[in-house]
């Protein structure tokens, strides 16, 4: 019954948050 991330309705927003965090991390490392 435990879902994969892609099946979860939260996945879309979670991926967006993850991408934004990655971008912030990149900028911080520059």
């Amino acid at each position: 019954c435990i879902h994969h991330l892609d099946e979860s309705p939260h996945s879309q927003a979670l991926k967006k948050v993850f991408a934004e965090n990655k971008e912030i991390q990149k900028l911080a490392e520059q």
Partner: antibody, heavy 117, light 112 residues
Framework: QIQLVQSGPELKKPGETVKISCKAS????????MNWVKQAPGKGLKWMGW????????TYTEEFKGRFAFSLATSASTAYLQINNLRNEDTATYFC??????????WGQGTSVTVSS | DVVMTQTPLSLPVSLGDQASISCRSS???????????LHWFLQKPGQSPKLLIY???NRFSGVPDRFSGSGSGTDFTLKISRVEAEDLGVYFC?????????FGAGTKLELK
């Protein structure tokens, strides 16, 4: 402010088709998934599935595979629920709801669908 | 599917009382990412459900602090410290850790 505004009540005959709209405003439509929930008269809430507003990919629960279809008009920030070949047991109020990383935070006001011959 | 069992189904209160609603899940709601996706909604007659508490204990924007959520694993509680007239309605717990998302049957908070 964030709002989900659904289309008005529908009275249909068995075998007909209905298409419900859910217009989003106050946020970036393609950043959040959209849930659809059914509530039969005097009953609880039943999750029908969701649509990814970025990719357009719908996900349906077992009960709602076949006659039900989620779709989008992304340019109009609108999600749709279509029910084909309506049955009496489809009589219910249908809600759309925005899905964040944490929860289902904002819901539409609901659209009442009555199926009667 | 995860079954959400709410108790009681009806809760008669007087204004100013404390109210407590229980929600038990048929399996753990701890997601592999560590989050617990257990939420509480209030639905008033003729309206859509409104989010009160998300992820067990987080109050949603604009929700008064008389509402609090607690719990872990499979056992969760919503407490209203002092019931006001605007709090009357049907409370639903919901889980979104597992697909399909599921809801409790609802608890009707009503006046004695």
């Amino acid at each position: 402010q964030i709002q989900l505004v659904q289309s008005g009540p529908e009275l249909k005959k068995p075998g007909e088709t209905v298409k419900i709209s859910c217009k989003a405003s106050g946020y970036t439509f393609t950043n959040y998934g959209m849930n659809w929930v059914k509530q039969a008269p005097g009953k609880g809430l039943k999750w029908m599935g969701w649509i990814n507003t970025d990719t357009g990919k719908p996900t349906y629960t077992e009960e709602f595979k076949g006659r039900f279809a989620f779709s989008l008009a992304t340019s109009a920030s609108t999600a749709y629920l279509q029910i084909n070949n309506l049955r009496n047991e489809d009589t219910a109020t249908y809600f759309c709801g925005r899905v964040t990383a944490d929860s289902m935070d904002y819901w539409g006001q609901g659209t009442s669908v009555t199926v009667s011959s | 599917d995860v079954v959400m069992t709410q108790t009681p189904l009806s809760l008669p209160v007087s204004l100013g009382d404390q109210a407590s609603i229980s929600c038990r899940s048929s399996q753990s709601l701890v997601h592999s990412n560590g989050n617990i996706y257990l939420h509480w909604f209030l639905q008033k007659p003729g309206q859509s459900p409104k989010l009160l508490i998300y992820k067990v204990s987080n109050r949603f924007s604009g929700v008064p602090d008389r509402f609090s959520g607690s719990g872990s694993g499979t056992d969760f509680t919503l407490k209203i410290s002092r019931v006001e007239a605007e709090d009357l309605g049907v409370y639903f717990c919901s889980q979104s850790t597992h697909v399909p998302l599921t809801f409790g049957a609802g608890t009707k908070l009503e006046l004695k």
